[in-house]
């Protein structure tokens, strides 16, 4: 058993049929010694008396808010949560496996630049009685500070018969050094509590591996005289690290119709302009990627050919 | 060329070669991003390799003030990785695929380090750690880790030279 926060405790249980469970001793936070009784949740049934209460925690029915009273007055509370371990593996019932970029990916994180700011998100089908708390650091043995905000519900979508809820959190490394080569990864830890179930999820990454620039901005077209060709120009996204002579991007320019199966023109360039062939009913799209490190491409920025 | 005395390197040549290094480092191990090597006890390996750190002057302001600190750090790293790529880790079993770009990568690391430090000038170089894994599978894992960390190192070096070529070239 360990303390998650004040008056909230997590009991770690091996979860299998007829498991013996864990013996837990609760102590009432009071100077009083006599006339103390214990109850669980809303029940008025007295579970025991005395300054301490010893219980055998085996299942969710044994978890909940234990309260010690004296003469009708509440003295203190202890909330017990369960963390299940099945076949040596901690349960992951609360969050959905996003399966990208690999199986057992519960947390996904992205950064728009090298400033040390990043966003992580996760998915669940649970809509109520759900709380998250996020901590982060650079490195684990001698951790350096990363400050995370509160996790918020950022999207809801319908997937078949189920509703899916996306939560996200923004974090900022306290002393970021955008130009340095990272040697210690960022660690992100998410505590998830659903009703009386506790689970924790972790992710470890370098900012360079989660970079995904915003799409290029201000796409403009200039038809070339006596030619089918069009000069397309664009600018670096505002959110990208500066100076651009140091933090350079490379670009992919593509002309394609509405369907992915249609023919296309495609060219790669380090410049912020390119010459392509425009077709009626097609769009010109441009996306960006770090020039020197193969992290994710941005989403496409598009303008119609016409 | 960058010499200990403090003259300027051939920024444009260094830029071209460092960008080539980036391409080669990724073609040597393109799927590196899909392999979570941190789970495999990274500490003993990649903590020994030289990293370009915050105080090394490789940021745009540091380069403007005095690029020599940064260039010396890059040079140390290039020599270090050049030695690693020529070591038993890469030459031993399992043999590299014949079409592996590691050979080109090795030669290009040497080429860039020579651009930075011509014959007859000496910057102190970092001691290469004795990483001699006994098992072929350990060697394979070590290669992946070294290439992954090399990708990060050459990316910073390429940014330095690109910025230098754009803003510091005479």
């Amino acid at each position: 058993i360990w303390e998650l926060k004040k008056d909230v405790y997590v009991v770690e249980l091996d979860w299998y049929p007829d498991a013996p469970g864990e013996m837990v001793v609760l102590t009432c936070d009071t100077p009083e010694e006599d006339g103390i009784t214990w109850t669980l949740d809303q029940s008025s049934e007295v579970l025991g008396s005395g300054k301490t209460l010893t219980i055998q925690v085996k299942e969710f029915g044994d978890a909940g808010q234990y309260t010690c009273h004296k003469g009708g007055e509440v003295l203190s509370h202890s909330l017990l949560l369960l963390h299940k371990k099945e076949d040596g593996i901690w349960s992951t019932d609360i969050l959905k496996d996003q399966k990208e970029p690999k199986n057992k990916t519960f947390l996904r994180c992205e950064a728009k630049n090298y400033s040390g700011r990043f966003t992580c998100w996760w998915l669940t089908t649970i809509s109520t009685d759900l709380t998250f708390s996020v901590k982060s650091s650079r490195g684990s043995s001698d951790p350096q500070g990363v400050t995370c905000g509160a996790a918020t519900l950022s999207a809801e979508r319908v997937r078949g018969d189920n509703k899916e809820y996306e939560y996200s959190v923004e974090c900022q490394e306290d002393s970021a050094c955008p130009a340095a080569e990272e040697s210690l990864p960022i660690e992100v830890m998410v505590d998830a509590v659903h009703k009386l179930k506790y689970e924790n999820y972790t992710s470890s990454f370098f900012i360079r591996d989660i970079i995904k620039p915003d799409p290029p901005k201000n796409l403009q077209l200039k038809p070339l005289k006596n030619s089918r060709q069009v000069e397309v120009s664009w600018e670096y996204p505002d959110t990208w690290s500066t100076p651009h002579s140091y933090f350079s991007l490379t670009f992919c320019v593509q002309v394609q119709g509405k369907s992915k199966r249609e023919k296309k023109d495609r060219v790669f360039t380090d410049k912020t302009s390119a010459t392509v062939i425009c077709r009626k009913n097609a769009s010109i799209s441009v996306r960006a990627q770090d020039r020197y490190y193969s992290s994710s491409w941005s989403e496409w920025a598009s303008v119609p050919c016409s | 060329r960058a010499v200990p005395g403090g003259s300027s390197p051939a920024w444009t040549q260094c830029q071209q070669l460092s960008q080539k290094l980036c391409t080669l480092a990724w073609s040597a191990h393109p799927l590196v991003g899909h392999m979570d090597l941190r789970e495999e006890g990274d500490e003993e390996t990649t903590n020994d390799v030289p990293h370009i750190q915050c105080g090394d002057g490789c940021d745009p302001q540091g380069l403007r003030d005095n690029s020599q600190f940064c260039l010396q750090r890059i040079h140390q790293g290039l020599i270090f990785y050049e030695k690693l790529l020529g070591s038993d880790i890469f030459t031993g079993e399992p043999s590299l695929l014949p079409d592996s770009p590691v050979g080109q990568l090795h030669a290009s690391l040497l080429g860039l380090s020579q651009l930075l430090q011509p014959e007859g000038h000496h910057w102190e170089t970092q001691q290469i750690p004795s990483l001699s894994p006994s098992q072929p599978w350990q060697r394979l894992l070590l290669r992946f880790k070294i290439l992954r960390s090399l990708q990060a190192f050459v990316a910073v070096a390429a940014r330095v030279f690109a910025h230098g070529a754009a803003t510091l070239s005479p």
């Epitope: 249609e262 023919k263 023109d265 790669f268 360039t269 380090d270 010459t275 062939i277 009626k280 | 073609s27």
Partner: antibody, heavy 118, light 107 residues
Framework: QVQLVQSGAEVEKPGASVKVSCKAS????????LHWVRQAPGQGLEWMGW????????EYAPKFQGGVTMTTDTSTSTAYMELRSLRSDDTAVYYC???????????WGQGTMVTVSS | EIVMTQSPATLSVSPGERATLSCRAS??????LHWYQQKPGQAPRLLIY???QSISGIPARFSGSGSGTEFTLTISSLQSEDFAVYYC?????????FGGGTKVEIK
């Protein structure tokens, strides 16, 4: 599968014109760009231009501008390349090729030998 | 127009050996570079597109690398059917241009 079959060899006199055909099969004709590339005997490859069968748009290499016309007939899935004012150095194998991507050449025809000789 | 230069013009290699072919562009072309193989009396065949992307059906012994102005085609272990002429082609800008070719012959 995608296939391009070209017309047979031609022998022409200097100053004449030649029209080479290229019949496509195995795909929707308007879904691919069509290019023409030539190769003089013992020499390298030379790009001549492309046509979009969907709308008849063309782009020719500057060297061939004014001397070449590329057309298509969507009813027969056939592309044509006409080269005018032939000279002896136009002697070459002419290839048509098709691709969904505009700038490189995936599927090639077998080639048509055009000999220009007086 | 962009001029593509291939070297060497002829490469003599023994079967089973590795062959490294070079292609240089007269200006930076990013990764807009493609490789073709041509055997006598046949049309060229696409091997690699956008500098390093492999084509399904092409043996894994063919690999490409490079960006900017310098590119390499590597054939890891030459088979008898690999003796041919190899061309690079840039697609950075029109007109599309080819290198002069490298003939890989049996040593």
């Amino acid at each position: 599968q995608v296939q391009l079959v070209q017309s047979g060899a031609e022998v022409e006199k200097p100053g004449a014109s030649v029209k080479v055909s290229c019949k496509a099969s195995g795909y929707t004709f308007t879904d691919y760009y069509l290019h023409w590339v030539r190769q003089a005997p013992g020499q390298g490859l030379e790009w001549m231009g492309w046509i979009d069968p969907e709308n008849g748009d063309t782009e020719y290499a500057p060297k061939f501008q004014g001397g070449v016309t590329m057309t298509t007939d969507t009813s027969t899935s056939t592309a044509y390349m006409e080269l005018r004012s032939l000279r002896s150095d136009d002697t070459a194998v002419y290839y048509c090729n098709a691709n969904k991507e505009l700038r490189y050449f995936d599927v090639w025809g077998q080639g048509t030998m055009v000999t220009v000789s007086s | 127009e962009i001029v593509m230069t291939q070297s060497p013009a002829t490469l003599s290699v023994s079967p089973g050996e590795r062959a490294t072919l070079s292609c240089r562009a007269s200006q930076s072309i990013s990764i807009n570079l493609h490789w073709y193989q041509q055997k006598p009396g046949q049309a060229p065949r696409l091997l690699i597109y956008f500098a390093s992307q492999s084509i399904s059906g092409i043996p894994a012994r063919f690999s490409g690398s490079g960006s900017g102005t310098e590119f390499t085609l590597t054939i890891s272990s030459l088979q008898s059917e690999d003796f041919a002429v190899y061309y690079c082609q840039q697609s950075n800008s029109f007109p599309l241009t080819f290198g002069g070719g490298t003939k890989v012959e049996i040593k």
